[in-house]
């Protein structure tokens, strides 16, 4: 997903990613910063009150694709996005709950920005 | 890879407790919960319950409330689960598997990555 | 809880066949319907969640569909290395449960 005005040049993927982490950091991450070969992700849920949770941090490539796509869950709401451009690049990611009682979102395309 | 690595066999004696491990590597530890399931011999799978390591929160079947206890050790990626007062009806082979899903709080239902599993024996 | 069933507890079928495996639940649990691959060594692999997405490195033959309570998984052109034990289970509500499992033979 490209926004607005986002150059749709080709851009070479940092072999090695870093991402900011926030909840979901590894243990030999610092200052809230991980590394991987895969994608950087921010995530969104519903906890059991309502409360909007937001989380980031790193996806190894492996099984990525299945991350980065909004996959149902039951009776709570997530949605995650995912990117790849450039280090820290899910600073700027803002996935947002999908509506409540409709699970359309599910199918919906994988989220990359 | 994620690769869930469990120990072959126990063997206890009945009125025992035992813990068993799952030492998990390949991913991050703490981001996916981490279920339990049981498998007598010869029978189908039992959900016996999950845990989220980064949280310590826990879910239980209510047939295991009273037997299992879920712990997990962040520094080492282990999850653990332990079985008290053993009888002859615990032997079976218990399995460790990680979710699909990154999770934070919400729960996830699906079963991606299985440990080879842990043949218990309760024995005099 | 709900229960899950596999009515069928064995199947023989020759290589190169079409299998269909099914499952039903005691209520709707909204498509949260997954298999399971248990292997004759013990070794079990994730084939296909909400009811009919495949897990990565899962072979394209093997395909799931339903919805409601009826739900089932097909394997087209059975493959020797396909020859295992299938589990059902549902994901919609706690305790997960999981159906008894169809032993799948070559003639």
């Known amino acids: 997903k490209k926004e607005d005005g986002e150059s749709t040049a080709p851009t070479a993927r940092p072999k090695v990613l870093r991402c900011k982490c926030h909840h979901h950091c590894p243990e030999d991450s610092v200052n809230n910063i991980c590394s991987t070969d895969g994608y950087c992700f921010t995530m969104i849920e519903e906890d059991d009150s309502g409360t909007p949770v937001v989380t980031s941090g790193c996806l190894g490539l492996e099984g990525s694709d299945f991350q980065c796509r909004d996959t149902p869950i039951p009776h709570q709401r997530r949605s995650i996005e995912c990117c790849t451009e450039r280090n820290e690049c899910n600073k700027d990611l803002h996935p947002t709950l999908p509506p409540l009682k409709d699970r359309d979102f599910v199918d919906g395309p994988i989220h990359h920005k | 890879q994620v690769q869930l690595q469990q120990p072959g066999a126990e063997l206890v004696k009945p009125g025992a407790s035992v813990k068993l491990s799952c030492k998990a590597s390949g991913y991050t530890f703490i981001s996916y919960w981490m279920h339990w399931v049981k498998q007598r011999p010869g029978q189908g799978l039992e959900w016996i319950g999950m845990i989220h390591p980064n949280s310590g929160s826990t879910n239980y079947n209510e047939s295991f409330k009273s037997k299992a206890t879920l712990t997990v050790d962040k520094s080492s990626s282990t999850a653990y689960m332990q079985l008290s007062s053993l009888t002859s009806e615990d032997s079976a082979v218990y399995y460790c598997?990680?979710?699909?899903?990154?999770?934070?709080?919400?729960?996830?239902?699906?079963?991606?990555?299985w440990g080879q599993g842990t043949i218990l024996t309760v024995s005099s | 809880d709900i229960q899950m069933t596999q009515t069928t507890s064995s199947l023989s079928a020759s290589l190169g066949d079409r299998v269909t495996i099914s499952c039903r639940a005691s209520?709707?649990?909204?498509?949260?319907l997954n298999w399971y691959q248990q292997k004759p060594d013990g070794t079990i692999k994730f084939l296909i969640y909400y009811t009919s997405r495949l897990h990565s490195g899962v072979p394209s033959r093997f395909s799931g569909s339903g919805s409601g309570t009826d739900y089932s998984l097909t394997i087209r052109n059975l493959e020797q290395e396909d020859i295992a034990t299938y589990f059902c289970q549902q994901g919609n509500t706690l305790p997960y449960t999981f159906g008894g499992g169809t032993k799948l033979e070559i003639k």
């Open positions: 598997a990680r979710d699909l899903l990154i999770a934070t709080v919400v729960v996830t239902p699906y079963f991606a990555y």
């Open positions: 209520q709707d649990i909204s498509n949260f």
